[in-house]
Amino acid sequence: GSVKVLHEPSCFSDYISTSVCQWKMDHPTNCSAELRLSYQLDFMGSENHTCVPENREDSVCVCSMPIDDAVEADVYQLDLWAGQQLLWSGSFQPSKHVKPRTPGNLTVHPNISHTWLLMWTNPYPTENHLHSELTYMVNVSNDNDPEDFKVYNVTYMGPTLRLAASTLKSGASYSARVRAWAQTYNSTWSDWSPSTTWLNYYE
């Protein structure tokens, strides 16, 4: 039977090394066996690359494409193939579809004056455009009370958050996670970091 795309590819870039495209077929598909996504920078003399997709679900395919040293004006031509049949053709501008990398190494340290110091790492090297563009959202939740949670927006440069222990329940176990957003690129939010857990206490 004929192969058809139900939901056309949606793509995001981490704006440093990788772009990811995801699409849905109209029936369960072995993505890696049946499909190929070709991509090429829209410039004379650019290489034509091929991405082998993987299954995310029965009929959902995802392709991770190495994309080197992205610059704002870059546009990629994308072509989705099933053998010799062109299923879909489109273009993708990484700078217009940024999903930042996930912040890393979230840790919690006791600090002076009954505060907790939450620290994490900026996922971009200093020379990358996004390094100085990121703002963060920190989610702090009580492990035993789903209604007890707080969201903090960190809009200053440093990847840190000071949290007064008194704003949390004493003796309760809390978990924190962090995600990033690049305002000037109108990005989507990054994935959440892995959670880190600690026991809150104060006198």
Partner: antibody, heavy 117, light 107 residues
Framework: EVQLVESGGDLVKPAGSLRLSCTVS????????VHWVRQAPGKGLEWLGM???????DYNSVVKGRFTISRDNAKNTVYLQMNSLRAEDTAMYYC???????????WGQGTLVTVSS | DIVMTQTPLSLSVSPGEPASISCRAS??????LNWYLQKAGQSPRLLIY???RLQSGVPDRFSGSGSGTDFTLRIGRVEAEDAGIYFC?????????FGQGTRLEVR
């Protein structure tokens, strides 16, 4: 860090042969094309040819048939094999990496080839 | 092959003054025009690609314009470190071809 380093330049007699090497680091030869460009003493730049990431090659007609570009991915090295050399091939030979629109964003330091009897 | 012609072949500019170099292609090359600077004893360095896009790390006193067959490189305020030979290169068609070069002296 992206780097290209040429080697193999030498004094060679007319009609002789020479193989130049361009060893790269900081990028993959399967994803970027590499070009050879030469510059005769006190003169301008002349494009000789390129090897694409996929392995195919293109040449300038002035050297086609005499010069051959190849590569060894395992050694991260691109080669320029030069045969039937002439006095007018005397030049500094550069390898360079392709960027957007056939722009050459990283160049080696060059290796000098002198063809003289 | 596409012939690239640069003018002037040399110019002398005082620090802080502007400078301009023209490059003409023998046929339409759209916006596929790149500029390089080669300082004495060094390899060429990419300054501008695709007519007007500044290569990473290049000071914004450099700018490029044009399309089709006529292109211009401008330096807003020349500095001593800008001395060298400037080459234009067409990137529309193989073989790639370069202009003959323009020597900029900063006096």
């Amino acid at each position: 860090e992206v780097q290209l380093v040429e080697s193999g330049g030498d004094l060679v007699k007319p009609a002789g042969s020479l193989r130049l090497s361009c060893t790269v680091s900081g990028f993959s030869l399967s994803r970027y094309s590499v070009h050879w460009v030469r510059q005769a003493p006190g003169k301008g730049l002349e494009w000789l040819g390129m090897i694409w990431g996929g392995g195919s090659t293109d040449y300038n007609s002035v050297v086609k048939g005499r010069f051959t570009i190849s590569r060894d991915n395992a050694k991260n090295t691109v080669y320029l094999q030069m045969n039937s050399l002439r006095a007018e091939d005397t030049a500094m030979y550069y390898c360079a990496r392709t960027y957007r629109g056939y722009a050459l964003d990283y160049w080696g330091q060059g290796t000098l080839v002198t063809v003289s009897s | 092959d596409i012939v690239m012609t640069q003018t002037p072949l040399s110019l002398s500019v005082s620090p802080g003054e502007p400078a301009s170099i023209s490059c003409r292609a023998s046929q339409d090359i759209s916006n596929y025009l790149n500029w390089y600077l080669q300082k004495a004893g060094q390899s060429p360095r990419l300054l501008i690609y695709y007519t007007s896009r500044l290569q990473s790390g290049v000071p914004d006193r450099f700018s490029g314009s044009g399309s089709g067959t006529d292109f211009t490189l401008r330096i807003g305020r020349v500095e001593a470190e800008d001395a060298g030979i400037y080459f234009c290169q067409q990137a529309n068609t193989l073989p790639l071809t370069f202009g003959q070069g323009t020597r900029l002296e900063v006096r």
